[in-house]
C-alpha cells in the first residue's frame, strides 16, 4: 500500500514559490495521496514546525471504503507578507512509523523599502544640536537613505548623505524632516516629522533688589530663533526646609505664585510677598512656538522689615517717684523677628530719655527728684533687625490712686504722620 515503503513519498504536489512585496497575501499548497485514514499535515518553515499556522486541510476519498486511497490537500495562507514569513516551506506527515517531508517551496520578500524607524515629531531649543533617526530595509538590499529638510534633499544623491542618524547642529525656525528610502524596486518616503523650535532656557536668573514684601529679579533670555519672545513667566513658591526643592527638582511642591513679564526688559518685580520669608523662583520664556524649559529653582529670601504699627494698649501710671509703663505687642505685622522695644520719656522742661527694654512688655521708671516732673509723656516702639517701627503717640503719665484701675490709653493705630516726634539719638 502507498506510504508504507520508505523510498516512496506520498506527496504528489509540493509547495510552490512566492516572492512579493510586504503586505502581499499568498497561499502555499501541498497534496498527497495515502491509503487508509488520512494523516494530519504539518507545515515546516526552515525545518521548524509552525504551531500556529493558518492552514486548512481538505480530504477527498477516492473510493467508498475507508481503506481506499485518499487525496489530502493542505493550504497554508500567508496574510500580509513580512520579513519574518520568508524562508523554506515544507509539508510533513507521519505515516505509520515513518515521517515524510515534501519538496521545499520558497517564500521571498522583494519590494519597496520598509521603514523600521521613522523621524518623530519633537521640540528643540533654538540653536541646539539634536539627532533624528530613520531606518529602512529591503529586500532587495541595499537600501540607501536620503534626508529631506523642508522638502529639500540634504545630499546630492541617496546614500551620499547621513544614513540612519541625522545630526542637526541647530535650527532657528520650526522645520520638517523626512527621509526617503531607495532600493532596486523604488522609493518609499517616511512620515514627515515636525521639529518645533522653542526658546532656549533663560540663563543667569538672579536677584536684583529686595524689599520686605517684594523682590526684583532679572535673567538673560536664551536664543529663540526667528520667533521673538512674547513674554516670560516667573514662578515663586514658599519654601520650607523640609520641602526639598533642590537645584534640579522639576516640579514645585505646591501651587506657585505665577507672574508674567512683558519683554524686554528681562526683569520683574514680584510683589505681595511675606517679609523675612524664603522663596524659590524660576523663569521660562515663551515665543509663538511655545515655552522654553524652566530654569532651576533659585532660592531667594525677602529681608526683614520694620514693624508696621506701634505697640498697643500702652498704659503709664505714676506712684511717687516711680512710673509703671506696660504695653502689648503691635497688632500690625512685625515683618520679621521682634527683637525688643524702645521706650522714650520726656518731661515738659527736661531732655528726653531713650531706653532699650528688650522683649519685656513692661518697665518701672525711677523718676529723678521728688516726682514733681510735670507733663511727663511716654512713647514706645517695637523693633526688628531692620530697625524701629513707628512710635506710639505720646501717652501722658497719670497719677495712680489706690483703689482705682490704672488708666489705659487706646492708641490711634498707624498714624499717617506722627503726632509726636523724637530727635535721632
Amino acid at each position: 500500500p502507498r506510504g508504507t515503503q520508505a523510498e516512496e513519498s506520498p506527496f504528489v504536489g509540493n509547495p510552490g514559490n512566492i516572492t512579493g512585496a510586504r503586505g502581499l497575501t499568498g497561499t502555499l499548497r501541498c497534496q498527497l495521496q495515502v491509503q487508509g485514514e488520512p494523516p494530519e499535515v504539518h507545515w515546516l518553515r526552515d525545518g521548524q514546525i509552525l504551531e500556529l499556522a493558518d492552514s486548512t486541510q481538505t480530504q477527498v476519498p477516492l473510493g467508498e471504503d475507508e481503506q481506499d486511497d485518499w487525496i489530502v490537500v493542505s493550504q497554508l495562507r500567508i496574510t500580509s507578507l513580512q520579513l519574518s514569513d520568508t524562508g523554506q516551506y515544507q509539508c510533513l506527515v507521519f505515516l505509520g512509523h515513518q515521517t515524510f517531508v515534501s519538496q521545499p517551496g520558497y517564500v521571498g520578500l522583494e519590494g519597496l523599502p520598509y521603514f523600521l524607524e521613522e523621524p518623530e515629531d519633537r521640540t528643540v531649543a533654538a540653536n541646539t544640536p539634536f539627532n533624528l533617526s530613520c531606518q529602512a530595509q529591503g529586500p532587495p538590499e541595499p537600501v540607501d537613505l536620503l534626508w529631506l529638510q523642508d522638502a529639500v534633499p540634504l545630499a546630492t544623491a541617496p546614500g551620499h548623505g547621513p544614513q540612519r542618524s541625522l545630526h542637526v547642529p541647530g535650527l532657528n525656525k520650526t522645520s520638517s524632516f523626512s527621509c526617503e528610502a531607495h532600493n532596486a524596486k523604488g522609493v518609499t518616503t517616511s512620515r514627515t516629522a515636525t521639529i518645533t523650535v522653542l526658546p532656549q532656557q533663560p540663563r543667569n536668573l538672579h536677584l536684583v533688589s529686595r524689599q520686605p514684601t517684594e523682590l526684583e529679579v532679572a535673567w538673560t533670555p536664551g536664543l529663540s530663533g526667528i520667533y521673538p519672545l512674547t513674554h516670560c513667566t516667573l514662578q515663586a513658591v514658599l519654601s520650607d526646609d523640609g520641602m526639598g526643592i533642590q537645584a534640579g527638582e522639576p516640579d514645585p511642591p505646591e501651587e506657585p505664585l505665577t507672574s508674567q513679564a512683558s519683554v524686554p526688559p528681562h526683569q520683574l518685580r514680584l510683589g505681595s510677598l511675606h517679609p523675612h520669608t524664603p522663596y524659590h523662583i524660576r523663569v521660562a520664556c515663551t515665543s509663538s512656538q511655545g515655552p522654553s524649559s524652566w530654569t532651576h529653582w533659585l532660592p531667594v529670601e525677602t529681608p526683614e522689615g520694620v514693624p508696621l504699627g506701634p505697640p498697643e494698649n500702652i498704659s503709664a501710671t505714676r506712684n511717687g517717684s516711680q512710673a509703671f509703663v506696660h504695653w502689648q505687642e503691635p497688632r500690625a505685622p512685625l515683618q520679621g523677628t521682634l527683637l525688643g522695644y524702645r521706650l522714650a520719656y520726656q518731661g515738659q522742661d527736661t531732655p528726653e530719655v531713650l531706653m532699650d527694654i528688650g522683649l519685656r512688655q513692661e518697665v518701672t521708671l525711677e523718676l529723678q527728684g521728688d516726682g514733681s516732673v510735670s507733663n511727663l509723656t511716654v512713647c514706645v516702639a517695637a523693633y526688628t533687625a531692620a530697625g524701629d517701627g513707628p512710635w506710639s503717640l505720646p501717652v501722658p503719665l497719670e497719677a495712680w490712686r489706690p483703689g482705682q484701675a490704672q488708666p489705659v490709653h487706646q492708641l490711634v493705630k498707624e498714624p499717617s504722620t506722627p503726632a509726636f516726634s523724637w530727635p535721632w539719638w
Partner: antibody, heavy 119, light 112 residues
Amino acid sequence: QVQLVQSGPGLVKPSQSLSLTCAVTGFSISSGYYWNWIRQFPGQKLEWMGYRSYDGSNNYNPSLKNRISITRDTSKNQFFLKLNSVTSEDTATYYCARGWLLHYTMDYWGQGTTVTVSS
Amino acid sequence: EIVMTQSPSSVSVTLGQSASISCRSSRSLLHSNGFTYLYWYLQKPGQSPQLLIYQMSNLASGVPDRFSGSGSGTDFTLKISRVEAEDVGVYYCGQNLELPLTFGGGTKLEIK
C-alpha cells in the same frame, strides 16, 4: 546694556589716599545689585575689596576694613573707592564690578585702572 | 576665609583638543539649598575678567557650550571640550558661598 567705566589717577604717593570712580550706565545703582571693587596684583592674584549695596549698606574685606571706604552718588549714578594710607603693596589694577544679590556673582566689570604707589 | 587653590598654574593645549583645569576649596562650597557656590572667570589678555560659569555648572549667558563645570563640595573641574584660539587667557575659580569672596591663583591656558 550695562556699562561700568572707571576713572582715577594712575599714580599715588605712599601714605596718601587712593580714590577711584566707577560710572555706571544702563542701570541705576540704587535700584539693585551690589557694586563691588576688586583688585588684581601684578602677579595676577585677585582680591575682593568690598561692595556698596543698592540700599546704601557696605561690606568690606576684613583685611582692608580700617583703610577702605566705598561711597556713592546716586544722582550721578557713580560709586567710589577710597583706600587710605597706601603703600607699594597696594600697587595693582583696580576693577569695579556689578554683583548679584544672592551670593555676589559678578557679571559686569569695568575696564580696570592700573594704580602705582610710588614716591 | 575660604582658600581657593588652582592647578596647574599653566596648561598648553593643541587647538581642537580638550583641556581641564582643577580647583580646590579649603571648605565645602555646597550650600544647604543644594547649590554649590563656585564660579569660573576667564581673563583674556588685556581684558577684564568675564563670567563663564556660576554655581559650579551653570553656563553664563553667551558662553559656548564647549565649556562645562563639574565637581563635588571641595574639588572642581573646568573642562573645555574643543579648545579654540579665543579661549587663551587666565582662568580663575572663585567661591561666593560667603564673604570675603576669594579667588584661586589662576591657570594660564596657551595654545601649543
